[in-house]
């Protein structure tokens, strides 16, 4: 990974584009920390394992988060 000690936040750009929950391999929510003072959301896609930084403020992404958490709560006993 192209990382050095000087890199503070993971996302160079963020996307507002809606993501189909079915095409998601993984959704990571990285809370704000001493290294990066903002929340970062990283989606890993099933296709080629592409990772995409999502805009936490986007309505489409907020809806995605709701859909994913709903799906998780259905699965957990």
């Amino acid at each position: 990974v192209p990382l050095s000690r000087t890199v503070r936040c993971t996302c160079i750009s963020i996307s507002n584009q809606p993501v189909n929950p079915r095409s998601l391999e993984k959704l990571e929510i990285i809370p704000a920390s001493q290294f990066c003072p903002r929340v970062e959301i990283i989606a890993t896609m099933k296709k080629k394992g592409e990772k995409r930084c999502l805009n936490p403020e986007s309505k489409a992404i907020k809806n995605l988060l709701k859909a994913v958490s709903k799906e998780r709560s259905k699965r957990s006993p």
Partner: antibody, heavy 124, light 109 residues
Framework: QMQLVESGGGVVQPGRSLRLSCTAS????????MHWVRQAPGKGLEWVAV????????FYVDSVKGRFTISRDNSKNTLYLEMNSLRAEDTAIYYC?????????????????WGQGTTVTVSS | EIVLTQSPGTLSLSPGERATLSCRAS???????LAWYQQKPGQAPRLLIY???SRATGIPDRFSGSGSGTDFTLTISRLEPEDFAVYYC??????????FGPGTKVDLS
């Protein structure tokens, strides 16, 4: 459509300063990292600097470190390159380029929108 | 620092022929971090391929990218008149920096 327009180039003497601007339209500028890339006459492309979408990180090629500063004003949809202590070898066409949507340190989507460039000539 | 080498320097071909352009890295590069660009005289570069093999928006399917590790390839299956240009590979590396190769010129034979 998505567009980037550079300005501020010109002829300048060695040791002097210049500020380039790049104005964006047709996309949400505040969502995208931005780059400056240059091309000396008859030569290939050389990456100069990058700034994260929110200005959180800035990085430079070694040859301009300490002389050039990349910055942005998201309220004005504008990217800047402040160039100090200019040298003859800085003579080039300077392009601004948009970092692809969703790029991060784990996956790179390339520079997907480019301006037409502004020419900087450093000569005495 | 990773150095990219492109070969050949110039490729002389005719429309309809297949073009195979090579990009070699001095150290292993993740395919997630490799891109290809096209530049025509007097124009800005244009993104063709990202992630070593994914076509950028609007790029015709005659352009394809492949490779991994230190060896990457851009293939143009059938050259169209508008494809005669200079092609650059580029990698995103540590620090982070974004390095371009020296370019391959595809010209009319």
């Amino acid at each position: 459509q998505m567009q980037l327009v550079e300005s501020g180039g010109g002829v300048v003497q060695p040791g002097r300063s210049l500020r380039l601007s790049c104005t964006a339209s047709g996309f949400t500028f505040s969502n995208n990292g931005m780059h400056w890339v240059r091309q000396a006459p008859g030569k290939g492309l050389e990456w100069v600097a990058v700034i994260w979408f929110d200005g959180m990180n800035k990085f430079y090629v070694d040859s301009v470190k300490g002389r050039f500063t990349i910055s942005r004003d998201n309220s004005k949809n504008t990217l800047y390159l402040e160039m100090n202590s200019l040298r003859a070898e800085d003579t080039a066409i300077y392009y601004c380029a948009r970092e692809g949507d969703g790029s991060g340190i784990y996956y790179y989507y390339g520079m997907d929108v480019w301006g037409q460039g502004t020419t900087v000539t450093v000569s005495s | 620092e990773i150095v990219l080498t492109q070969s050949p320097g110039t490729l002389s071909l005719s429309p309809g022929e297949r073009a195979t352009l090579s990009c070699r890295a001095s150290q292993s590069v993740s395919s997630s971090y490799l891109a290809w660009y096209q530049q025509k005289p007097g124009q800005a570069p244009r993104l063709l391929i990202y992630g070593a093999s994914s076509r950028a928006t609007g790029i015709p399917d005659r352009f394809s990218g492949s490779g991994s590790g230190t060896d990457f390839t851009l293939t143009i299956s059938r050259l169209e008149p508008e494809d005669f240009a200079v092609y650059y590979c580029q990698q995103y590396g540590s620090s982070p920096i974004f390095t371009f190769g020296p370019g391959t010129k595809v010209d009319l034979s």
